[in-house]
């Protein structure tokens, strides 16, 4: 009956973790005798390809500096404990401690028996780092050039990890990678990028980072931060002021970053009512006359700069009952 | 401890059969495979073939193959070497050997001359 | 069947010297090889296996090398008790195979 090694093709193990080599010789057959199991490393340099052997009598062997005995051990292999008893090598996995990056490579086991001979399988063990990621909102002015809005950051993954964003606004990513602190790991870095509008002050986009260490993407939310001038309007007139109404008021309505600082209530005929009285964002009138046929401007300012809205009023001689009856407030 | 105790020195004639034997102790006797080896005088060493006795397989050297019986009895844990039609050339000091990762233990040695 | 040619096959050396035996497999046999040390009268003793492990008890001026046909035995400071025939053997594949001995003697 033939025997085959039993390994399994790929193998990942975390880096500074452990990672076991499965290795079994199969099936069981009476009478067929490992003599000796070794691992080697067939694409190391020549003083570093024997990594491993269990000699049934003399136990497990660690040749080479690199992994080295203290950080290689046989999982279930056994010596003989005495003359009257089997060593047992039918299992030899091979566990490997403190994974570094250097340990990525093929690895043979390898079971000399008799009498069938030599049998070998061959693993590829992969060493995997499992990213940190980050992401953050650059606090950025509102400009008429692209500038990175938000940073979304992998830190020391292997391999590389891989950057999207999720947004519904007009965008464009630009990526760098790096070299991590620990050795073979890479640190990406991708940065959202877009003309800075108040239009984006406020959103959240989403970093979505994939990596093969993670059961499913990473998503981190970041809220976007534009510093912009007041974006102005004005609201509360309904297009019913009449002669003696006392119940108006005009509302400046404003969209910043940051708060605004101050509010300037004024007209485009330099005349300004006395009966309108501006208090902050609201201008309130006490009694509507002639001097209110006129534009009202609110002027808004802030750290970053100002805004203005403008409002025609038409003062009409009685109230319109054919409106929807409407009182601005 | 291990131990392979093998018969004393023979002396045949060509043609004839000589049966060597080796008798173990200090371990499981079924449980590993009896191997037998050859040294002609100033010579190397040359594998003859092997007995299971745990159930009787046996494996030979295709070279004596025909002329070579490897067999053992576990009731006395002692393992025996046939070879038959004997020739000049089969003047050797053989041992029985017991593979324990490599030929670990060994047997004093028989000495077996073929001489007209 | 797979042939060990061993070289030299008479070696002579003062103590303290370096010595060097070779075996060359007539096919790949991984690193499936032995050497073994053979005194007068005695059966052999084994020295190296997995062409490059050392042996319980065996002293670490005696190293093996080498992997698929070619493999070397060391001696890095020759002792006068060192003085024996020392064999290769292959056991990748049945039937094992023996290299046809090197002796060494002291100078």
């Known amino acids: 009956q033939d025997v085959r090694v039993q390994v399994l093709p790929e193998v990942r193990g975390q880096l500074g973790g452990t990672v076991e080599l499965p290795c079994h010789l199969l099936p069981p057959v009476p009478g067929l005798y490992i003599s000796l199991v070794t691992w080697q490393r067939p694409d190391a340099p020549a003083n570093h390809q024997n990594v491993a052997a269990f000699h049934p009598k003399m136990g497990p062997s660690f040749p080479s500096p690199k992994p080295g005995s203290e950080r290689l051990s046989f999982v279930s292999a056994k010596q003989s404990t005495g003359q009257d008893t089997e060593a047992e090598l039918q299992d030899a996995t091979l566990a490997l401690h403190g994974l570094t990056v250097e340990d990525e490579g093929n690895y043979t086991c390898e079971f000399a028996t008799f009498p069938k001979g030599s049998v070998r399988g061959m693993t590829w063990l992969r060493v995997i780092a499992k990213p940190k990621n980050q992401a953050e909102a650059q606090k950025v002015t509102f400009s008429q050039d692209p500038t990175t809005v938000a940073l979304c950051i992998s830190k020391e993954g292997r391999p590389p990890a891989r950057i999207s964003w999720l947004s519904s606004l007009d965008w464009e990513a630009k990526e760098t990678q790096v070299s991590g602190t620990l050795a073979g790991t890479v640190t990406v870095t991708s940065r959202f990028t877009l003309v800075p509008s108040g239009r984006a002050d406020g959103v959240t986009v989403t970093c979505k980072v994939e990596h093969e260490s993670f059961e499913e993407p990473a998503l981190i939310p970041v809220t976007l931060s534009v510093r912009y001038p007041p974006e102005v309007s004005i609201s509360g007139y309904d297009d019913n002021w009449y002669l003696g109404r006392t119940d108006a008021t005009l509302s400046c309505d404003v969209r910043s970053n940051p708060e605004p600082t101050g509010y300037d209530w004024s007209t485009t005929s330099g005349t300004f009512p006395t009966s309108a009285v501006a208090q902050g964002s609201q201008l309130v009138i006490h009694a509507v006359d002639s001097l209110f046929n006129t534009t009202f401007v609110c002027t808004v300012t802030n750290a970053v700069g100002m805004g203005r809205a403008e409002q025609v009023i038409f003062v009409r001689e009685t109230p319109n009952t054919a409106g929807a009856g409407a009182t601005g407030g | 401890q291990v131990q392979l105790v093998q018969s004393g020195a023979e002396v045949k004639k060509p043609g004839s059969s000589v049966k060597v034997s080796c008798k173990a102790s200090g371990y499981i006797f079924t449980s590993y495979w009896i191997h037998w080896v050859r040294q002609p005088p100033g010579k190397g060493l040359e594998w003859i073939g092997a007995?299971?006795?745990?159930?009787?397989?046996?494996n030979y050297n295709q070279k004596f193959q025909g002329r070579v019986t490897i067999t053992a009895v576990t009731s006395t844990s002692t393992a025996y070497m046939e070879l038959s039609s004997l020739r000049s050339e089969d003047t050797a000091v053989y041992y029985c050997?017991?593979?324990?990762?490599?030929?670990?233990?060994w047997g004093q040695g028989t000495t077996v001359t073929v001489s007209s | 069947d797979i042939v060990m040619t061993q070289s030299p096959s008479t070696l002579s050396a003062s103590v303290g010297d370096r010595v060097s035996v070779t075996c060359k497999a007539s096919?790949?046999?991984?690193?499936?090889v032995v050497w073994y040390q053979q005194k007068p009268g005695q059966p052999p003793k084994t020295l190296i296996y997995s062409a490059s492990y050392r042996y319980s008890g065996v002293p670490d001026r005696f190293t093996g090398s080498g992997s698929g046909t070619d493999f070397t035995l060391t001696i890095s400071s020759l002792q006068a008790e060192d003085l024996a025939e020392y064999f290769c053997?292959?056991?990748?594949?049945?039937?094992?195979?023996f290299g046809q001995g090197t002796k060494l003697e002291i100078k």
């Open positions: 053997q292959q056991y990748n594949t049945n039937p094992f195979t």
């Open positions: 007995v299971y006795p745990g159930n009787s397989d046996s």
């Open positions: 050997t017991k593979l324990v990762g490599t030929f670990d233990y």
């Open positions: 096919q790949n046999v991984g690193i499936n």
